[in-house]
Amino acid sequence: LVVTPPGPELVLNVSSTFVLTCSGSAPVVWERMSQEPPQEMAKAQDGTFSSVLTLTNLTGLDTGEYFCTHNDSRGLETDERKRLYIFVPDPTVGFLPNDAEELFIFLTEITEITIPCRVTDPQLVVTLHEKKGDVALPVPYDHQRGFSGIFEDRSYICKTTIGDREVDSDAYYVYRLQVSSINVSVNAVQTVVRQGENITLMCIVIGNEVVNFEWTYPRKESGRLVEPVTDFLLDMPYHIRSILHIPSAELEDSGTYTCNVTESVNDHQDEKAINITVVESGYVRLLGEVGTLQFAELHRSRTLQVVFEAYPPPTVLWFKDNRTLGDSSAGEIALSTRNVSETRYVSELTLVRVKVAEAGHYTMRAFHEDAEVQLSFQLQINVPVRVLELSESHPDSGEQTVRCRGRGMPQPNIIWSACRDLKRCPRELPPTLLGNSSEEESQLETNVTYWEEEQEFEVVSTLRLQHVDRPLSVRCTLRNAVGQDTQEVIVVPHSLPF
């Protein structure tokens, strides 16, 4: 590229006209402030291309950089560019105007920056000052660029004298920014709300000074915009929160709410989403099955648990045989309802050292103004079996009887067994089961009674032995779901003294 006049710096008179020419082996163009001003382009007979830029009625505002570049740099070896700087000294123009963004200089590390205050006349003396200070700062000045150096976070102005007039530039603001990788967290006061209630979401980012929050949410799609509030939390630096508040939610506000946070300095971004459900009215729903018959073991502690979902938070009551239960002062009953997640609850009834009297019909009721649910079950107290009596008798009929009486809940099973060889039994020889109908020598009669007050069964079983010819060890074993008990008696023949 060939530029005439060659520059690299020209000082031109105000109100004059000046012609710049650029030529090259491919189409060329003049650029000024990233734009192409009106210019005449031509192609000579020898195949060279040229562009002529005519600057008319020059003013100080024409001061600045001019570039000649290839119009289409594809296929060329280099992106060749020629720079020319033109000054048009103009006493009516103090400092050249800056775009608003040039007045704010952001930096993320200690690095050299330029405060771009420029004048139209390269002969002018320009000084740099703190906005509130008179002392000129010892920073080098380039008339084409401005003041370059390492600057503190402060406000600066440039000063010059044009004739007898002191001129100040706009203020330049230098900001050293706190920037780190972005990590966003989003939460909601509630993720389930009823129609008419408020939705409040919070998006938090820590460690970045300049961030932009953008929310997307269901009602935004329908053009109903909500203005978020940015809150600077004060517990630590750069702990910034955006609050999206939607009053009086509607069913259509259900859906995904996304907070997108961008940091403009390094162009980092992160986003997080949360689902919000708007329900027409509140609800209470049981989760899982609880059998209608529940068991507890006498003198042991037993916790009965019900899991349910509810919104809004419900009141939970427990009843036994239609009477309200409360935490007993004696510590026999403990009631608790825990919120295990936003809408999930676990309600527990704990019976401490269960008593027989605690058997009965239990109901848990969970309710609020919109809905209720109840769950009922029968609690059975299981009592380990006890053999209360084992006795032998010699009725006149000549047979011998052994009577076994025991109690327990649930109903005990009775097992009779006998051992004829007292020396080897029961270790070496297994006892023989008695009472099977096939055996003629013994007969069995069993009666079962349910005792309402004690809430347990009583079993009375009588074993009739037809002829006992030698000593016999007879064993009565009672067994139920929670245990077993055994007693033994030696039955001797009539003819032998015991």
């Epitope: 809150d231 600077f232 004060l234 630590m236 750069y238």
Partner: antibody, heavy 119, light 106 residues
């Protein structure tokens, strides 16, 4: 020009209450967190309480938690410190201060207001 | 809670002399320290923040340095208008002031 002007100080008996106000001007009040800092006679500065720009979060030093309440009214460009159950150790000059957004250091202060708790 | 230990509590200096005040935090405060000047009957004035960044209008004779738990604040040549009390404050986790340093003329 940023200005913070405190009012409402004075002499109060132990156990009684007092409400301090701080009228702010010269800046967009709703963009700034606010604070109260105190200085007991012959002692150093002591942060008391802060409130975020939205008023949604408040922070207190342990010795005043449950007794002092910081609040703000953006319509009136004013922040408040409600001081209940006052003790003699609360005697101090109370300064209203503004937090710079984000970094949170105190960038502008009021002149201060004397609160004396004495029987 | 973070504690701030400021020393010395008082300091006598001649005009033109250099003085240094130190503040030690009970844990790292990641450079989140600011320094204030307090004169009787006036509002405290922010001089410096983020360890070493001078506030607009703070003369360049003031400087600060430090990292982690240890920080210092200096006036390179004391002028009569610098006679005041100086306080550091950490703002890394809520706010704790140092005990203060009273600067007097010799």
């Amino acid at each position: 020009e940023v200005q913070l002007v405190e009012s409402g100080g004075g002499l109060v008996q132990p156990g009684r209450s007092l409400k301090l106000s701080c009228a702010a001007s010269g800046f967009t009040f709703s963009n700034y967190g606010m604070a109260w800092v105190r200085q007991a006679p012959t002692q150093g500065l002591e942060w008391v309480a802060s409130i975020t720009n939205s008023g949604g979060n408040t922070y207190y030093r342990d010795s005043v938690k449950g007794r002092f309440t910081i609040s703000r009214d953006s319509a009136k460009n004013t922040q408040y410190l409600q001081m209940d159950s006052l003790r003699s150790e609360d005697t101090a000059t109370y300064f209203c201060a503004r937090h710079t957004p984000g970094a949170n250091y105190f960038d502008y202060w009021g002149q201060g207001l004397m609160v004396t708790v004495s029987s | 809670d973070i504690q701030m230990t400021q020393s010395p509590p008082s300091l006598s200096a001649s005009l033109g002399e250099k003085v240094t005040i130190t503040c030690q935090a009970s844990q790292s405060i990641k450079n989140y320290i600011a320094w204030y000047q307090l004169k009787p009957g006036t509002a405290p004035r922010l001089l410096m923040r983020y360890t070493s960044t001078l506030e607009s209008g703070t003369p360049s004779r003031f400087s600060g340095s430090g990292s982690g738990r240890d920080y210092s604040f200096s006036i390179s040549n004391v002028e009569s208008e610098d006679i005041a009390s100086y306080y550091c404050v950490q703002y890394a986790n809520l706010y704790t002031f140092g005990g203060g340093t009273k600067l007097e003329l010799k």
